[in-house]
Interface confidence: low
């Protein structure tokens, strides 16, 4: 189970993980105390290559080709959490692990 | 964490799980002894609706809108295995649990 890593200079057309820094201040999300920004990454690219497909199911659906099936798309296949300090709706400060905030790997599914 | 269920008569445009029976015999996959067919299901539909997004990350990337980011796509968010009886490459009969063969839920990621 693997995925490709790319950067803004890459010429790779296949499904790939790209760096992306999310800046909460830039969004105006001022209820987030820390981190103010973090490396989230994102997935982009084409999915016509079998070796990047995460599940055998993806290949089977491609073969069956049902109505409305758009084919596999490039999406996170492994994600990890980050620890965040933020205000909740009652203006209390919360420290917690927020799941699925960082893309570690991309694949076709 | 939830997803929509549809069928071939649905007018639903959002990301949805549709029924699909995979027929191994029809594919010519004669190394699979059993099952000869099974209900695999598949995902299809649009992903512009926040409530079907699986991860907060999806919403953040949409806000950041990086180059090449195609927006979330409708993909399996929960899958389950099936038990299969099949010939391996050495012509031995194997009985095993094959992961991620059935789509239980679809979402936008």
């Amino acid at each position: 189970d693997f995925g490709l890593d790319c950067d803004e200079h890459s010429t790779e057309s296949r499904c790939c993980r790209y760096p992306l820094t999310v800046d909460f201040e830039a969004f105006g999300w001022d209820w987030i105390i820390a981190p103010k920004r973090y490396k989230a990454n994102y997935c982009s690219g084409e999915c016509e290559f079998v070796f990047l497909q995460k599940y055998p199911h993806t290949h089977l659906v491609h073969q069956a080709n049902p109505r409305g099936s758009a084919g596999p798309c490039c999406t996170p296949t492994k994600m990890s959490p980050i620890n965040m300090l933020y205000f909740n709706g009652k203006e209390q400060i919360i420290y917690g692990k927020i799941p699925a905030m960082v893309v570690d790997r991309c694949g076709c599914s | 964490d939830f997803g929509l269920d549809c069928d071939e008569h649905s007018t639903e445009s959002r990301c949805c799980r549709y029924p699909l029976t995979v027929d191994f015999e029809a594919f010519g996959w004669d190394w699979i002894i059993a099952p000869k067919r099974y209900k695999a299901n598949y995902c299809s539909g649009e992903c512009e609706f926040v409530f079907l997004q699986k991860y907060p990350h999806t919403h953040l990337v949409h806000q950041a809108n990086p180059r090449g980011s195609a927006g979330p796509c409708c993909t399996p968010t929960k899958m389950s295995p099936i038990n299969m009886l099949y010939f391996n490459g050495k012509e031995q009969i194997i009985y095993g649990k094959i992961p991620a063969m059935v789509v239980d839920r679809c979402g936008c990621s």
Partner: antibody, heavy 122, light 110 residues
Framework: EVQLVESGGGLVQPGGSLRLSCAVS????????KGWVRQAPGKGLEWIGI???????YYASWAKGRFTISRDNSKNTVYLQMNSLRAEDTAVYFC????????????????WGQGTLVTVSS | AVVMTQSPATLSLSPGERVTLSCQAS??????LSWYQQKPGQPPKLLIY???TLASGVPSRFKGSGSGTDFTLTISSLQPEDAATYYC????????????FGQGTKVEIK
């Protein structure tokens, strides 16, 4: 104290305009989705529209073009601009706050103002 | 757009009785349903969201259930202070972040 207070209602002639204000206190305006809902005398609730955390607005189909929602974070106030008013727009107008400050529950309003009455009549 | 239909229009029951209010969506809305209570001269109060989650401060005698197109609000033992009009409400993604309310059910105390 956490509260929403609407103002700006009153009597207006058909074809006229009115701007309603919703002053919020006790929380940060930009952290929450805000909505406007109206209720004609003796009738049920009718959704007008929302402004979400990022400032995007969404409207009921009947309100598009005539009604505009905006906000001023520095004044902690949300506005509803109503144009080309008709007799059937006569109602109590409520300002409401979405219950989730991460923007995923745009539609569940857990904090409401007392409402302001708008009467459209000649 | 989704249309929400509530039944009955009016209900008259005695204190202590079990109350069942119904809300039907014109198409599947999964769990995207909220219930509100409104008393005369007051704004609505959120009771239930996501079909079955009790809002903060709401007594446990209120219970929401259902998914897809059929939803129910149950008051296990009616109290005098529960006399009000109850509205269901959904989020309608198809009309791009639209919200639809049911027409309401008025609960009276005998």
């Amino acid at each position: 104290e956490v509260q929403l207070v609407e103002s700006g209602g009153g009597l207006v002639q058909p074809g006229g305009s009115l701007r309603l204000s919703c002053a919020v206190s006790g929380f940060t305006l930009s952290h929450y989705v805000k909505g406007w809902v109206r209720q004609a005398p003796g009738k049920g609730l009718e959704w007008i529209g929302i402004i979400n955390i990022s400032g995007s607005t969404y409207y009921a189909s009947w309100a598009k073009g005539r009604f505009t929602i905006s906000r001023d974070n520095s004044k902690n106030t949300v506005y509803l601009q109503m144009n080309s008013l008709r007799a059937e727009d006569t109602a109590v107008y409520f300002c409401a706050r979405g219950h989730d400050n991460f923007g995923y529950s745009y539609h569940d309003f857990n904090l409401w103002g007392q409402g302001t009455l708008v009467t459209v009549s000649s | 757009a989704v249309v929400m239909t509530q039944s009955p229009a009016t209900l008259s029951l005695s204190p202590g009785e079990r109350v069942t209010l119904s809300c039907q969506a014109s198409q599947s809305i999964h769990h995207e349903l909220s219930w509100y209570q409104q008393k005369p001269g007051q704004p609505p109060k959120l009771l239930i969201y996501l079909a079955s989650t009790l809002a903060s401060g709401v007594p446990s005698r209120f219970k929401g259930s259902g998914s897809g197109t059929d939803f129910t609000l149950t008051i296990s033992s009616l109290q005098p202070e529960d006399a009000a009009t109850y509205y269901c409400q959904t989020y309608d993604g198809i009309s791009h972040y639209g919200v639809a309310f049911g027409q309401g059910t008025k609960v009276e105390i005998k």
